[in-house]
Every structure is written in structure tokens, then in C-alpha cells.
Interface confidence: low
């Protein structure tokens, strides 16, 4: 048959951050190409990345249709130069991916501190709300729009002159913290989804921002 010399894909892996979702697999093709199908668990499969020589396929536009749905993908292997034949009755070799539920499994991207503003002994720290490719009514949603109160941020802050860190938490994108007057502070934030019990419940820490630099503003 036409598929006897093709090798089934393996090591199918979902790579997803802030809902940008790529399916990766092996092996690098030698005389074969791949087509990916994704199922919204309806029993129907939608084909993507037709006859590609890549070993990855961007499935973001499919999974963002319903990020709380659970998806399964499969990768078909075809001989290089394959042209689909309507007379073919044999399915090519394929491999199933693990299940993937974007809402539960997408990694949280590294957050960014948008600004901080000191007023007396208070500092207001604002976390930049990242945009995602999730849409509602033709509008792209932010990470906060998607996760709502499921998403919190943890702020780590410390005096520039010491290493003792303090923490604060918020379920918005803003912190209001007490600081000692006349002291400079440094800040880092981390996105967290407390309801998750897996390794992807926290993002990496944001880049450190310190008072006295351009993102800050000080008012008495």
C-alpha cells in the first residue's frame, strides 16, 4: 500500500502559553509528510497543517474557540509527494496526542510590571494585562478576561538595600502596598491560578523593576 514506508509520529506534545498552542511531534520527516487533525471531542476531526514537512502545527485558532473544552489531536504520516486519492481506502499511520484542556493546562506567560506609582508611604503596582488569541464577539480577550478571579498575581517586593522579600496577592491586576518613606523598593510579580494542582499553576517571575527607574513615578 501507499503508506507502508511511512513512520507513525511519536512524542506528541502540547506546547501552550497564554493559549498560544502548538502541537509538536517527532520524527523529523525523511520522505514523508504529516497532516494533523484535532477533535473538539465531538467525534468529528478537523484537519490542519496539510502535508507539512514541519514537526509542529499551530492549533491556536482551533482551541481558542472553546478553551474549556478538551481536545485530542492526531498526526497522520504520508509518503512525501502524497496527493490525496479519493480512491484510497486505507488510512495512513497516525498517533494520538495526550488530551489537552487549554483552560487547565496552558502555561501562564511571564508577566510584566506595567507601572508603579508611589504616593507617600503607598505604592500602587500595576501588572500588564496580556492579550490572548481567545475571542468573544470578535474581540480579543485579555488573560484576566479569560480567567477572571481564577487568576491571581503574587507580588514580591523588597528594599533595594536588603534581601528580605515581602509578598502581596491580588485577584485584580493592581497592588497597593505599604512602604517605608524614603526607601527604594524592587518588585517582581508572578501569575498564579491557585485552583490548579499541577506544575503549571504558576508563571515564571516577571523581570525585576526597581523604584528610581523609568517605570516608576513618585508623588508626595
Amino acid at each position: 500500500s501507499g503508506t507502508t514506508n511511512t513512520v507513525a509520529a511519536y512524542n506528541l506534545t502540547w506546547k501552550s502559553t497564554n493559549f498560544k498552542t502548538i502541537l509538536e511531534w517527532e520524527p523529523k520527516p525523511i520522505n514523508q509528510v504529516y497532516t494533523v487533525q484535532i477533535s473538539t471531542k465531538s467525534g468529528d476531526w478537523k484537519s490542519k497543517c496539510f502535508y507539512t514537512a514541519d514537526t509542529e502545527c499551530d492549533l491556536t485558532d482551533e482551541i481558542v474557540k472553546d478553551v474549556k473544552q478538551t481536545y485530542l489531536a492526531r498526526v497522520f504520516s504520508y509518503p512525501a509527494g502524497h496527493v490525496e486519492s479519493t480512491g484510497s481506502t486505507e488510512e495512513p499511520p497516525y498517533e494520538n496526542s495526550p488530551e489537552f484542556t487549554p483552560y487547565l493546562e496552558t502555561n501562564l506567560g511571564q508577566p510584566t510590571i506595567q507601572s508603579f506609582e508611589q504616593v507617600g508611604t503607598k505604592v500602587n503596582v500595576t501588572v500588564q494585562d496580556e492579550w490572548t488569541l481567545v475571542r468573544r464577539n470578535d474581540t480579543f480577550l485579555s488573560l484576566r478576561d479569560v480567567f477572571g478571579k481564577d487568576l491571581i498575581y503574587t507580588l514580591y517586593y523588597w528594599k533595594s538595600s536588603s534581601s528580605g522579600k515581602k509578598t502581596a496577592k491580588t485577584n485584580t491586576n493592581e497592588f497597593l502596598i505599604d512602604v517605608d518613606k524614603g526607601e527604594n523598593y524592587c518588585f517582581s510579580v508572578q501569575a498564579v491560578i491557585p485552583s490548579r494542582r499541577t506544575a503549571n499553576r504558576k508563571s515564571t517571575d516577571s523581570p525585576v523593576e526597581c523604584m528610581g527607574h523609568e517605570k516608576g513615578e513618585s508623588r508626595e
Epitope: 507513525a8 473538539t40 471531542k41 488510512e91 499511520p93 498517533e95 488530551e99
Partner: antibody, heavy 117, light 112 residues
């Protein structure tokens, strides 16, 4: 013609072993998921296990550790190795293609296995 | 484990009757609708009627229909024909890292 044909059934004593074969024609077993299902006399259908197109196997709890599904892609045949057989394993054993999403679903005619002393 | 419970276990009906068989899963089937219905006649292998809860298999008459989602499913025969007297099984698919399949205990449709 796309079909599957089971063979290897027969009479076996309790504690004995038997290997069933499922010969596929008209398609390649390396491209499909193949299941074994059984039906005890006068009873309903019971799923035994499946070998995926990737060669991975999954089993029902009732047969885990006793039954093994394998395949020979060169011969285009799927096997069910049954060990430590019990009287309650007496059934017609069916081989079927494509239980995952319902498409491409093909069943064989079945082969009878009788476990009795 | 996934368990499928059909009701009724048997029923008597006449040609032309509308027949409904229900199937309940102990937990949601894969994708909420990876649920198939089979027809089996004595001494024969099962024949696929419905897959994906509501999709008609190739060559199956349109008097057969399926509905439902999650854990509750229904097979309906809109107008029972003489050749429809048989046993019907639902079959659910479950996936949680391992694939698992389960059949209902069957519903025998007999002539009244």
C-alpha cells in the same frame, strides 16, 4: 474486501492458555485501532482491550494481567493471548476495527472459546 | 471504571411503533458524545447504528436516531420494522490517559 476474520477458538481446560488470531484484509492494521470484545452465552457484550495504531495497548480490568493483545503488521494480524483461563471466560470472541469515533467500524464473525474441564 | 446502564432491559412493541431506549453512563463519555449504538441479531456480530451520539452510520436507515450528551443518551426507532427486532447495545468511550470502552447490558426488542 475490507474484513476481519477471527480464528483459534476451541475447548480449553481451566488454567489453560489459548491464542486467538484476527486476520485483517483490505486495510493495514498499523493504521487502525483494533479491539477484542467478547460475549458470554446469552449475555451482553464486554470490551476486553484494544491495540492502537501506535501499538499501545489498553485492557479492561477483568482481564488485565491475564490477556495480552499483540500484532504482526507484516502478517496484518492481531492476536489475543489468553492465560489462566477460567470458566467465566467462556464466550464468543470478536475482533473489531475502529471503536474510537465510530467510523470505519468493522466486526468479525467471532470465534467461540469454551473453558471447561 | 465507566459503566453503562440501559433501560429497559427488554420491551415488546409492534411494527410501526416508536421505540425509545435510554443509556446512562456512570461518568461523562469522552467529549460528552463518544457514544455508539449497536444492533445485534442472534448468532450475528453487532452492527453499528449510531456513533458520536447522533451520527448515523453508513447504510443505516434514517428511522434510527440518537441523541444525548454527557451521561444520558437515547436511541429512537421512529417506526419499528420487522427487521428491527433485535438486541440493542450502547457503547461508551472514556479517556483519561488510558482508553476505556464499556457496553450497556443490552435491550431486547421483541414482537408484541
Amino acid at each position: 474486501q475490507v474484513q476481519v476474520v477471527e480464528s483459534g477458538g476451541g475447548l480449553v481446560k481451566p488454567g489453560g492458555s489459548l491464542r486467538l488470531s484476527c486476520a485483517a484484509s483490505g486495510f493495514s492494521i498499523s493504521s487502525y485501532d483494533m479491539s477484542w470484545i467478547r460475549q458470554a452465552p446469552g449475555k451482553g457484550l464486554e470490551w476486553i482491550g484494544i491495540i492502537g495504531s501506535n501499538g499501545r495497548t489498553y485492557y479492561a480490568d477483568s482481564v488485565k494481567g491475564r490477556f495480552t493483545i499483540s500484532r504482526n503488521t507484516n502478517e496484518n494480524t492481531v492476536y489475543l493471548q489468553m492465560n489462566s483461563l477460567r470458566a467465566e471466560d467462556t464466550a464468543v470472541y470478536y475482533c473489531a476495527r475502529g471503536l474510537y469515533d465510530g467510523t470505519g467500524n468493522i466486526w468479525g464473525q467471532g470465534t467461540l472459546v469454551t473453558v471447561s474441564s | 471504571d465507566l459503566q453503562m446502564t440501559q433501560s429497559p432491559s427488554s420491551l415488546s412493541a409492534s411494527v410501526g411503533d416508536r421505540v425509545t431506549i435510554t443509556c446512562r453512563a456512570s461518568q461523562s463519555v469522552y467529549g460528552n458524545n463518544w457514544l455508539s449504538w449497536y444492533q445485534q441479531k442472534p448468532g450475528k456480530a453487532p452492527k453499528l447504528l449510531i456513533y458520536g451520539a447522533s451520527k448515523l452510520a453508513s447504510g443505516v436507515p434514517s428511522r434510527f436516531s440518537g441523541s444525548g450528551s454527557g451521561t444520558q443518551f437515547t436511541l429512537t426507532i421512529s417506526s419499528l420494522q420487522p427487521e428491527d427486532f433485535a438486541t440493542y447495545y450502547c457503547q461508551g468511550t472514556y479517556y483519561s490517559g488510558d482508553w476505556y470502552f464499556a457496553f450497556g447490558q443490552g435491550t431486547k426488542v421483541e414482537i408484541k
